[in-house]
Interface confidence: low
Amino acid sequence: VPPGEDSKDVAAPHRQPLTSSERIDKQIRYILDGISALRKETCNKSNMCESSKEALAENNLNLPKMAEKDGCFQSGFNEETCLVKIITGLLEFEVYLEYLQNRFESSEEQARAVQMSTKVLIQFLQKKAKNLDAITTPDPTTNASLLTKLQAQNQWLQDMTTHLILRSFKEFLQSSLRALRQM
């Protein structure tokens, strides 16, 4: 159930409405729960979760990752730079979340929920960053050809790609969650 729609919220009409920050916080936690469910299916289906980090690092995926220069860590924290990085990163992850859509059997709905919830999260964050103009949107043509390339991989590489996307997205969201709590 997406944040704000669980029975606790419905049963508590006198509860204070969530602040913008609380909504974002709850949204990220909801997506992280979804990723956990998807990772469970991936790990049960293949042995990718046991693959060494070194082997996984040799992939050629250009997945968004937090770095010191992005200003999202406690060391060198910069609110504006970090917010731009979070939104840009989430926009870049969208093509990978689209790729995940046909990769699950029992968790098909969960994969869709993660994708849709991420779109909502981006909207929340764009409202928060309405005065920032440094946000670049990925090129649709580039995304379309990347998606075609990923879907043309052999089964083993597709399993590897799925695992890497989930792991990287989880790490990116965790870093984002921490940073957003400072804003």
Epitope: E22, D25, S36
Partner: antibody, heavy 122, light 109 residues
């Protein structure tokens, strides 16, 4: 290698004062929030106080509020805990802990000192 | 400052799986972190951010969190895993840190 070394513990009478120090090395001290955590004999861990990287923001457990003061000297790479109006229930090993590269409002402690014993007794 | 609740003790046979739980209101919106402490020693971080493992911590340690309950799992417990385990989180306001009461893990056999 990260090192945290506490000092300043000892035996003090109820109502007395002590100042604990924690000398830090092996990391950029001024970039990280720090905390004090204590452990009474045979008991669990209890968070005492935290201070952000610049020293401008502090936080305290209800049990020590108004009696303890946390501070830091980034030039000396040292964390302090000034303890006043000490009570027997403050008897514990006091650990200095470095917060991981996290948000100040969502701390975890990736490095700990070995602790310094504080005994409050008449 | 809201409390986190852990079972006070747990026994596990050598090589079996141990699951230590931690419950508390703030865990619904805050991360859970886990520490191992052996007698006379300082605590050591074994899991952070619900399910992330610091470098140097064996792969048998894993964590999960859902709906206000965090779980530390030790798959194939070893004799050296015996000790006290504490969960920790921030309170709901984020202004204070909170520890669970600790769970003493005994590895039998």
């Amino acid at each position: 290698e990260v090192q945290l070394v506490e000092s300043g513990g000892g035996l003090v009478q109820p109502g007395g004062s002590l100042r604990l120090s924690c000398a830090a090395s092996g990391f950029t001290f001024s970039s990280y929030a720090m905390s004090w955590v204590r452990q009474a004999p045979g008991k669990g861990l209890e968070w005492v106080s935290a201070i952000n990287s610049g020293g401008g923001s502090t936080s305290y457990a209800d049990s020590v509020k108004g009696r303890f003061t946390i501070s830091r000297d980034n030039a000396k790479n040292t964390l302090y805990l000034q303890m006043n109006s000490l009570k027997p229930e403050d008897t514990a090993v006091y650990y200095c802990a470095k917060e991981g590269d996290t948000g100040w409002k969502d701390p975890m402690y990736d490095y700990w000192g070995q602790g310094t014993q504080v005994t409050v007794s008449s | 400052q809201s409390a986190l609740t852990q079972p006070s003790a747990l026994s596990v046979t050598l090589g079996q799986t141990a699951k230590i739980t931690c419950q508390g209101g703030s865990l619904g919106t805050r991360y859970a972190h886990w520490y191992q402490q052996k007698p006379g020693q300082a605590p050591v971080l074994v899991i952070y951010d619900d399910d992330s493992r610091p470098s140097g911590i064996p792969e048998r340690f894993s964590g999960s969190s859902s709906g206000g309950r965090a779980t530390l799992t030790i798959s194939g417990a070893q004799a050296e895993d015996e000790g006290d385990y504490y969960c920790q989180s921030a309170d709901s306001s984020g202004n204070a840190s909170v520890f669970g009461g600790g769970t003493h893990l005994t590895v039998l056999g």
